[in-house]
């Protein structure tokens, strides 16, 4: 029963992680540049995402624009986009496998096959988690590097956006969920032995009598 609870918890965490990756992918807040000038016309915040950028004026107006082409996206965000999309697809596969291998589903009859499927699902979630943590951490590294680079103009210095924190949370959930599912060991195939043992015992008992 404890194994069942662990499995449900693992799946739940991984699914939450998968949803968080989608949110991280969709939110246009990977990098944030704020210009707080002496003047409200030029005081604005620029959000950069994987799909669009947004300009938020100090007056509260927000204008978002989808990137015209893939080339409009900086190289690090191009790579991040690719990895995050792959991560979403991989995590979706993990969800599918975890449903198939779930103790409370009847997709597979064999308990051993179910357990193995669940371990594969766990590994898949771990992979998805790694695929998220890499671009998120790389983007954060670049932002921090530029922030302390004296050659980068202060107006060009970006800050870490909410998407990066969501991304770290997502990878944490996927890694944790995947780890719990990998702990789901397959049952030992000792049924034949126990059957032989009980047969031997009953035979011995009848001889004694």
């Amino acid at each position: 029963m404890a194994s069942m609870g662990l499995q449900v918890m693992g799946i739940a965490l991984a699914v939450l992680g998968w949803l968080a990756v989608m949110l991280c992918c969709a939110l246009p807040m990977w990098r944030v540049t704020a210009f707080i000038g002496s003047n409200i016309v030029t005081s604005q915040t620029i959000w950069e995402g994987l799909w669009m950028n947004c300009v938020v004026q100090s007056t509260g107006q927000m204008q978002c624009k989808v990137y015209d082409s893939l080339l409009a996206l900086p190289q690090d965000l191009q790579a991040a986009r690719a990895l995050v999309i792959i991560s979403i697809i991989v995590a979706a596969l993990g969800v599918l496998l975890s449903v198939v291998g779930g103790k409370c589903t009847n997709c597979l009859e064999d308990e051993s096959a179910k357990a193995k499927t669940m371990i594969v699902a766990g590994v898949v979630f771990l992979l998805a988690g790694l695929m998220v943590i890499v671009p998120v951490s790389w983007t954060a590294h670049n932002i921090i590097q530029d922030f302390y680079n004296p050659l980068v103009a202060s107006g060009q210095k970006r800050e870490m956006g909410a998407s990066l924190y969501v991304g770290w949370a997502a990878s944490g959930l996927l890694l944790l969920g995947g780890g719990l599912l990998c702990c789901n060991c397959p049952p030992r195939t000792d049924k034949p032995y126990s059957a032989k043992y009980s047969a031997a015992r009953s035979a011995a008992a009848s001889n004694y009598v």
Partner: antibody, heavy 119, light 110 residues
Framework: EVQLVESGGGLVQPKGSLKLSCAAS????????MSWVRQAPGKGLDLVAD??????????YYADSVKDRFTISRDDSQSMVYLQMDNLKTEDTALYYC??????????WGQGVMVTVSS | DIVLTQSPALAVSPGQRATISCRAS??????????MNWYQQKPGQQPKLLIY???NLDSGIPTRFSGSGSGTDFTLTIDPVQADDIATYYC?????????FGSGTKLEIK
């Protein structure tokens, strides 16, 4: 539709004072920053001053050429913007426009009011 | 301050394409966001916002108007030009304080 109507312009002597008013309608005045932009005869446009909305603490900005001489203010209850101009100089002669701030620019403009500084 | 340079005048025949340029003394773009606006001022009238963020048409502006460019070079295109388009066109940046305007390009019809 955004409507801005300026008033208070006229002829004034150097070192004199004048107060321009701008009545706004057709939009949620409380949510927008407002500004005064001027255009000297036959010349281009120059931002004179701007003021943010209440949510941004009514922050103000003044062009270097008018600092300590001009004061921008607003009255949200009346949807009015004002420009108090003191110690006027001949180079302040221009058409003064009241403009609403939008997208890092000026989205709605009044017809303008002429200010002539001459002895 | 960022200086915006525009050519003083441009003469175009009706039905033709008019291309008005604006060059900034330094980049007015950040992270593929182009902080440049365009205005039209007809004789004796107040200016009117045409395009914001270099390429976004303000509401109610005909699709004959379009904007492009990034970094330091920006273009306002009117295609096709109509007699009603006689005006002075100004560019304005919001990259840093103070926001400045170009000197304006007067569009004349041949």
């Amino acid at each position: 539709e955004v409507q801005l109507v300026e008033s208070g312009g006229g002829l004034v002597q150097p070192k004199g004072s004048l107060k321009l008013s701008c009545a706004a309608s057709g939009f949620d005045f409380n949510s927008y920053g407002m500004s005064w932009v001027r255009q000297a005869p036959g010349k281009g446009l120059d931002l004179v001053a701007d003021i943010s909305s209440k949510s941004y603490s009514y922050a103000t900005y003044y062009a270097d050429s008018v600092k300590d001489r001009f004061t921008i203010s607003r009255d949200d209850s009346q949807s009015m913007v004002y420009l108090q101009m003191d110690n006027l100089k001949t180079e302040d002669t221009a058409l003064y426009y009241c403009a609403m701030i939008l997208y890092g620019g000026f989205g709605g403009w009044g017809q303008g009011v002429m200010v002539t500084v001459s002895s | 301050d960022i200086v915006l340079t525009q050519s003083p005048a441009l003469a175009v025949s009706p039905g033709q394409r008019a291309t008005i340029s604006c060059r900034a003394s330094q980049s007015v773009s950040i992270s593929s966001v182009n902080l440049m606006n365009w205005y039209q001022q007809k004789p004796g009238q107040q200016p009117k916002l045409l395009i914001y963020h270099a390429s976004n048409l303000d509401s109610g502006i005909p699709t004959r108007f379009s904007g492009s460019g990034s970094g330091t070079d920006f273009t306002l295109t009117i295609d096709p030009v109509q007699a009603d388009d006689i005006a002075t066109y100004y560019c304005q940046h919001s990259r840093e304080s103070p926001p400045t305007f170009g000197s304006g390009t007067k569009l004349e019809i041949k």
